[in-house]
Amino acid sequence: MMTGTIETTGNISAEKGGSIILQCHLSSTTAQVTQVNWEQQDQLLAICNADLGWHISPSFKDRVAPGPGLGLTLQSLTVNDTGEYFCIYHTYPDGTYTGRIFLEVLESSVAEHGARFQIP
């Protein structure tokens, strides 16, 4: 039975040209995290494998940095980076947990962080 929950940074906004940290946290389970995948709608951004470390996809290598922790830092943001991001926790023995973050990249300096929320 899957008892864990994923807490994410929720809906967030950031300025064009700036950077943002995408962060998820898995709680309420003793399952072992074997791998965390970070994905956009149709692309893999990065994988953090418990044995092998980080793999950043080639198309994102110049502006994605691993961490902090199991999170991901997006740099040199453009308006095209607006959209959904998913953290996918592969665990044993529970299986897969998925968290969702919506990022809005703004032209102006009115960007501010949204509230944190949970996905069971």
Epitope: N37, L44, D51, L52
Partner: antibody
Framework: DVQLQESGPGLVKPSQTLSLTCTVS?????????WSWIRQPPGKGLEWIGY???????NYNPSLKSRVTISRDTSKNQFSLKLSSVTAADTAVYYC??????????????WGQGTSVTVSS | DIQMTQSPSSLSASVGDRVTITCRAS??????LAWYQQKPGKAPKLLIY???SLQSGVPSRFSGSGSGTDFTLTISSLQPEDFATYYC?????????FGGGTKLEIK
């Protein structure tokens, strides 16, 4: 250039343990790479067996996990495969390969030429 | 485990032809997909990783595309040395799994 060379007996009896070694040359074995074994039965496709990481963590294919051990000897620039309780279904060409996970993820960029193992009495 | 299915299993083509090979995953693998070329008696050679990234030294006539569950390998203009068997591999999650292969033969 990185080179990998498999070695071991070409014939193993059923129920015995298959033991293979992969020697790595032209490369610092202690740096941040993992090392993998893959096999290919005659006329068939490829099957990933498992890997050993630079930190000595191992990960095995669940279909073989109960019979497989991968280890390494950094002083000899070698890593090894042991597969116990073999049957005719384990007859295959066995390949060793490098995993440059940071750059290629789980895609394997350097392979040995393969060694053929037949399980027969 | 994620099953990888390639089609066609064999294909006849001529030098200069444009050829497309398809690989389908039984579940989502995002863009974590590699393509290999294997010639008889030889080890597989990495052509493409992360669905569309060309491995160093591989001719630009090879290209890969796709995401999610459906992927293609395209050879824009077949050369004599391209006749071989091609395999896809998902590197999304272990156990990493391969397709059954597509044998490309001379027509």
């Amino acid at each position: 250039d990185v080179q990998l060379q498999e070695s071991g007996p070409g014939l193993v009896k059923p129920s015995q343990t298959l033991s293979l070694t992969c020697t790595v040359s032209g490369h610092s074995f202690t740096s941040d790479y993992a090392w993998s074994w893959i096999r290919q039965p005659p006329g068939k496709g490829l099957e990933w067996i498992g890997y050993i990481s630079y930190s000595d963590s191992t990960n095995y294919n669940p279909s073989l996990k109960s019979r497989v051990t991968i280890s390494r000897d950094t002083s000899k620039n070698q890593f090894s495969l042991k597969l116990s309780s073999v049957t005719a279904a384990d007859t295959a060409v066995y390949y060793c390969a490098r995993l440059d996970y940071g750059n290629y993820g789980g895609a394997m960029d350097y392979w040995g030429q393969g060694t053929s193992v037949t399980v027969s009495s | 485990d994620i099953q990888m299915t390639q089609s066609p299993s064999s294909l006849s083509a001529s030098v200069g032809d444009r050829v497309t090979i398809t690989c389908r995953a039984s579940q989502h693998v995002s863009t974590a997909l590699a393509w290999y070329q294997q010639k008889p008696g030889k080890a597989p050679k990495l052509l493409i990783y992360s669905a569309s990234s060309l491995q160093s030294g591989v001719p630009s006539r090879f290209s890969g595309s796709g995401s999610g569950t459906d992927f293609t390998l395209t050879i824009s203009s077949l050369q004599p040395e391209d006749f071989a068997t091609y395999y896809c591999q998902q590197h999304y999650i272990t156990p990493w799994t391969f397709g059954g292969g597509t044998k490309l033969e001379i027509k």
